[in-house]
Interface confidence: low
């Protein structure tokens, strides 16, 4: 898991004669916004192919009005980063598409008009966790300067964000058996094994063999509720004597407010104060409407024409997410039967079947028993791509070729004596028991417990099991 971040530094007329003076048409003022699209791999892809790694839309920039006779400036840009979260591994090679859009604010019928001003495409190799990469690109008569990077989030590290690491509360040496996750010297791979019995819910450890308690819990294994804890209200580790610790991160740690929002703590939660143009619990929403084309991968946008109205993306088959930005993991439905391996090829699903199975979904069980004989009256049972023999009594082994002692498993209960017989076994029951395996006690009055003894059989008589 992680996030790709793009920072636009400047967008303006490129050098040389014939450069445009203004992005706005003659109809009046306009403002810019940007769309970023990420596609995996380095192949040349059609512009309309899905942004399979994700996409993001910036807020609108400040309104720009052309000043006659003034030198053509770099144009005013939207605030903040463009962020594209990715849930799986960072691919390392990708195509980056940055579109610059113009919103004209003149008196158009039907409200503002949008048009694509410039598009740049870069095919790049980039390791997650590295420094910002800077770039300058020309698109027609325009020049775009930007920086980008991919960084891991949550507990993921590594160039592909695939290794999980445990953040340490303070930079220090890792405990025995742990080594730092380069280049972050204050993180250690693999959580240590805590003291045996340490509460999973209320305890944790930073070194193997220890057990430290969260607020409200105490005791060597953090299983005792602390009615009056001396460290209540404190933030961070307390002394070892109190045996308690307020969970370190506060609600604003790591700043949950996106797009430059500022965070303030409220009881048990947080509140974001958002910059102009952003709102939502985490300032993650800009005033996006259907006119911005927020639905990716061919999604149909439904919503009001007025700029403040909400929108909904109706996604085509194979895509999901509020902006149809996520490809449906069709393999998660486990369509391949009988242990087949599922491969999502994009255009189709493919099942790679285990030996002994076939069909588009591995639904056909090949005849495992063809040409396989089970000896001594055994019957062949298909399953799992290999044949298995169900042997007649007195025989065992893979092909029922070995003689088996039916009494070896001591099948007669309650001290009954077992006799091997040509067609199976016979149990001679101890006094007080009956049944083919001596499993039923006999009541003292001579009436047996269920099931009743068959006619002609007295309790205690040997019974042959057929």
């Amino acid at each position: 898991a992680g996030v790709f971040e793009l920072q636009i530094h400047s967008f303006g007329p490129g050098p040389g004669p014939g450069a445009p003076r203004s992005p706005c048409s003659a109809r009046g003022p306009c403002r810019l916004f940007f769309r970023v699209c990420l596609k995996p791999g380095l192949s040349e892809e059609a512009a309309e192919s899905p942004c399979a790694l994700g996409a993001a839309l910036s807020a609108r920039g400040p309104v720009y009005t052309e000043q006659p006779e003034a030198p053509a400036p770099d144009l005013p840009l939207p605030n903040g980063l463009l962020q594209v979260p990715f849930r799986d591994a960072w691919p390392g090679t990708f195509s980056l598409i940055i579109e610059t859009w113009r919103e004209e604010l003149g008196d158009q019928i039907g409200g503002p008009a949008w048009s694509l001003l410039a598009r740049v495409t870069r095919r790049r190799r980039l390791a997650a966790g590295g420094p910002w990469a800077r770039d300058i690109q020309r698109a027609g008569a325009w020049e775009l300067r930007f920086s980008y990077r991919a960084r891991c989030e949550l507990l993921a590290v590594g160039t592909a964000c695939t290794r999980l690491c445990r953040p340490r509360s303070a930079p220090s040496r890792c405990g025995p058996g742990l080594r730092p996750c380069a280049p972050l010297e204050d993180e250690c791979e693999a959580p240590p094994v805590c003291r045996a019995g340490c509460s999973l819910e209320h305890g944790f450890c930073e070194q193997p063999g220890e057990c430290r308690c969260l607020e409200g819990w105490t005791g060597p294994l953090c299983t005792v509720p602390a009615s009056t804890s001396s460290c209540l209200g404190l933030r961070g580790p307390s002394s070892a004597t109190t045996g308690c610790l307020v969970p370190g991160p506060g609600p604003c740690d790591g700043n949950p407010c996106a797009n430059g929002g500022s965070c303030s703590e409220t009881p048990g939660s947080f509140e974001c104060t958002c910059p102009r143009g952003f709102y939502g619990l985490r300032c993650e929403v800009s005033g996006v409407t259907c006119a911005d084309g927020p639905c990716f991968n061919g999604g149909l946008c439904v919503g009001g024409a007025d700029p403040d109205s909400a929108y909904i993306c109706h996604c085509p088959p194979g895509f999901q997410g509020s902006n149809c930005e996520k490809r449906v993991d069709r393999c998660s439905l486990q369509p391949c039967r009988n242990g087949g391996l599922c491969l999502d090829l994009g255009h189709a699903l493919r099942c790679r079947c285990r030996a002994g199975f076939a069909g588009p979904r591995c639904e056909h069980n090949l005849d495992d028993c063809a040409g396989r004989a089970c000896a001594n009256g055994g019957t062949c049972v298909e399953g799992g791509g290999a044949h298995r023999c169900s042997c007649a009594l007195g025989f065992g082994g893979r092909d029922c070729r070995e003689r088996a002692d039916p009494c070896a498993a001591r099948p007669c209960a309650h001290g009954g004596r077992c006799y091997a017989h040509f067609s199976g076994l016979v149990c001679a029951c101890a006094p007080g028991y009956m049944g083919s395996r001596c499993e039923f006690p006999v009541h003292p009055d001579g009436v047996s417990a269920l099931p009743a003894a068959p006619p002609g059989l007295r309790p205690g008589d040997p019974q042959r099991y057929l």
Epitope: S269, G280, L281, S309, A310
Partner: nanobody
Framework: EVQLAESGGGSVQAGGSLRLSCVAS????????MAWFRQAPGKEREEVAA????????WYADSVKGRFTISRDNAKNTVYLQMNSLKPEDTAMYYC??????????????????WGQGTQVTVSS
């Protein structure tokens, strides 16, 4: 067509409790803001509580903090409003609203795309 259906309204004495439910049909709950609004006769519609379905983060109007609790069951496409310690001034028609994406700034009730028909709550003293 997306539909929101509220239920659970009724009449109750001051200090009593009610639990409102809102079921969304033909609508998936991912990345959605679900909110409860209320409107008393002759007054403006006001937002009471909101919840973001992805992470369960909530918001409450000052007038109901500590008394009302909003929750959701994504598997059932349902959002609830548990109302305790009801007061006569809580009397209103209560509406459920849905909006894809996160919750907008307070007061932006026009940004909710879908609305239920409402359920009446009457609190007598």
């Amino acid at each position: 067509e997306v539909q929101l259906a509220e239920s659970g309204g009724g009449s109750v004495q001051a200090g009593g409790s009610l639990r409102l439910s809102c079921v969304a049909s033909r609508y998936t709950f991912s990345s959605t803001c679900m909110a409860w609004f209320r409107q008393a006769p002759g007054k403006e519609r006001e937002e009471v509580a909101a919840i973001y379905t992805d992470d369960g983060s909530t918001w409450y109007a000052d007038s109901v903090k500590g008394r009302f609790t909003i929750s959701r069951d994504n598997a059932k496409n349902t959002v609830y409003l548990q109302m305790n310690s009801l007061k006569p001034e809580d009397t209103a028609m209560y509406y459920c609203a849905a909006r894809r994406w996160a919750c907008p700034r307070v007061g932006s009730w026009h940004e909710f795309a879908y609305w239920g028909q409402g359920t009446q709550v009457t609190v007598s003293s």
